[in-house]
């Protein structure tokens, strides 16, 4: 089991971890259609980690501890998209995380509603955005979920950020 | 004409992994422009949604297994696949390919026949 | 138990008109679209309606499809024998960030 998040260190009294859910606009798009902006929030902060020397033989304390800001909560929405003048595909569906919390958790621990948004291909075209994960942190959320090797056109992308929580 | 048709064992033991193949004719998977599923359903019950691949390989799983699906992709045999470990007597199903309407969530258009899959020892 | 509600069966005479209702939540129904699957005895289940209303290429238009609120109801008139089969509904779930499906209900035609 992954040990608790840490707010407070022992070296460092005076500082505490913080992460917070940050309101921002994304830009949902695909080539060819309209673009939607969506309110949704993303996650910042500073969460504690630190790493020990090693010893050999190993104490049994963990020297290596990581912590990262993190959807606590989030659920996956449909968001649909209307594509004029295409009639095969007059509408096209993409699957966006709405975060509703955040948390410093363990950086291996699995968000409670993961995946990849179901990313469609396509060269940029109207309404279609340069595509850039809005997390600001780093982590891939695992359990299986795989991502593309780089953001292709039409994911959404973080377009402003709003007031703090 | 797209067909859609699963294979893979009819018989899995208990904790062992459940493997089956969606073979896609008619149709390019890698020509984009469609999710595809894989959905399963209890003997004498209804259907339950399992997860979705595209053909980049994205995926995204239904939540409630999640932790023991994995669904892949192989373009170049048109194929995809799903992987369920740690299977129970309560994965004894019919499991179905699917694929959606073009880029639409939950409209399942095309189905293959269905496979049937026992778990027991 | 499943997320969506629909009555385990119904039944009319051939040439008469059946409706099967399906009722979710906010979460589900009542902001996403609906589809309806036919699943003949032994055979995969058949998309019939989509995006709430809308008919695939080869359905007859004797199959109907409305949502008002948390509802969506499947309309079929002029029954004939070959309807006899389980309706499905379908649709999103952001709660549960998943697909959900209906427990179905089976038509019988007298």
């Known amino acids: 089991a992954a040990p608790p998040p840490i707010n407070k260190l022992a070296l460092f009294p005076d500082k505490s971890a913080w992460c917070e859910a940050k309101n921002i606009t994304q830009i949902v798009g695909h080539s060819g259609c309209e673009a939607k902006s969506i309110q949704n929030r993303a996650c910042l902060g500073q969460c504690f980690s630190y790493s020990v020397p090693n010893t050999f033989p190993q104490s049994t304390e963990s020297l290596v501890h990581c912590d990262s800001c993190m959807p606590a909560q989030s659920m996956w929405e449909i968001v649909t998209l209307e594509c004029p003048g295409h009639e095969e595909v007059p509408r096209v569906d993409k699957l966006v995380e709405k975060i509703l919390h955040c948390s410093c958790q363990a950086c291996g621990k699995e968000p409670s509603h993961e995946g990849l948004s179901v990313y469609v291909q396509g060269e940029d075209g109207p309404g279609s955005q340069p595509g850039t994960h809005p997390h600001p942190h780093p982590h891939p959320h695992p359990g299986g979920q795989t991502p593309e090797p780089e953001d292709p056109p039409g994911a959404p992308h973080t377009e402003e950020e709003g007031a703090e929580d | 004409q797209v067909q859609l048709q699963e294979s893979g064992p009819g018989l899995v033991k208990p904790s062992q992994t459940l493997s089956l193949t969606c073979t896609v004719s008619?149709?390019?998977?890698?020509?984009?422009?469609?999710?595809w599923s894989w959905i399963r359903q209890h003997p004498g019950k209804g259907l339950e949604w399992i997860g979705y691949?595209?053909?980049?390989?994205?995926?995204y799983y239904n939540p409630s297994l999640k932790s023991r699906v994995t669904i892949s992709v192989d373009t170049s045999k048109n194929q995809f696949s799903l992987k369920l470990s740690s299977v129970t007597a309560a994965d004894t199903a019919v499991y179905y390919c699917?694929?959606?309407?073009?880029?639409?969530?939950?409209?399942?258009?095309?189905w293959g026949q269905g496979t049937m899959v026992t778990v027991s020892s | 138990q499943s997320v969506l509600t629909q009555p385990p069966s119904v039944s009319a005479a051939p040439g008469q008109k059946v409706t099967i209702s399906c009722s979710g939540s906010?979460?589900?129904?009542?902001?996403?679209?609906v589809s309806w699957y036919q699943q003949l005895p032994g055979t995969a289940p058949k998309l019939l309606i989509y995006?709430?209303?809308k008919r695939p290429s080869g359905i007859p238009d004797r199959f109907s499809g409305s949502k008002s609120g948390t509802s969506a109801t499947l309309g079929i008139t002029r029954l004939q024998t070959g309807d006899e089969a389980d309706y499905y509904c379908g649709t999103w779930d952001s709660s549960l960030s998943a697909g959900v499906f209906g427990g179905g209900t089976k038509l019988t035609v007298l």
């Open positions: 008619g149709g390019s998977i890698s020509s984009g422009g469609y999710y």
């Open positions: 699917a694929r959606d309407a073009p880029l639409r969530i939950g409209a399942f258009d095309i």
């Open positions: 995006d709430n209303n």
């Open positions: 691949i595209y053909y980049s390989g994205s995926t």
């Open positions: 906010s979460s589900n129904i009542g902001n996403n679209y």
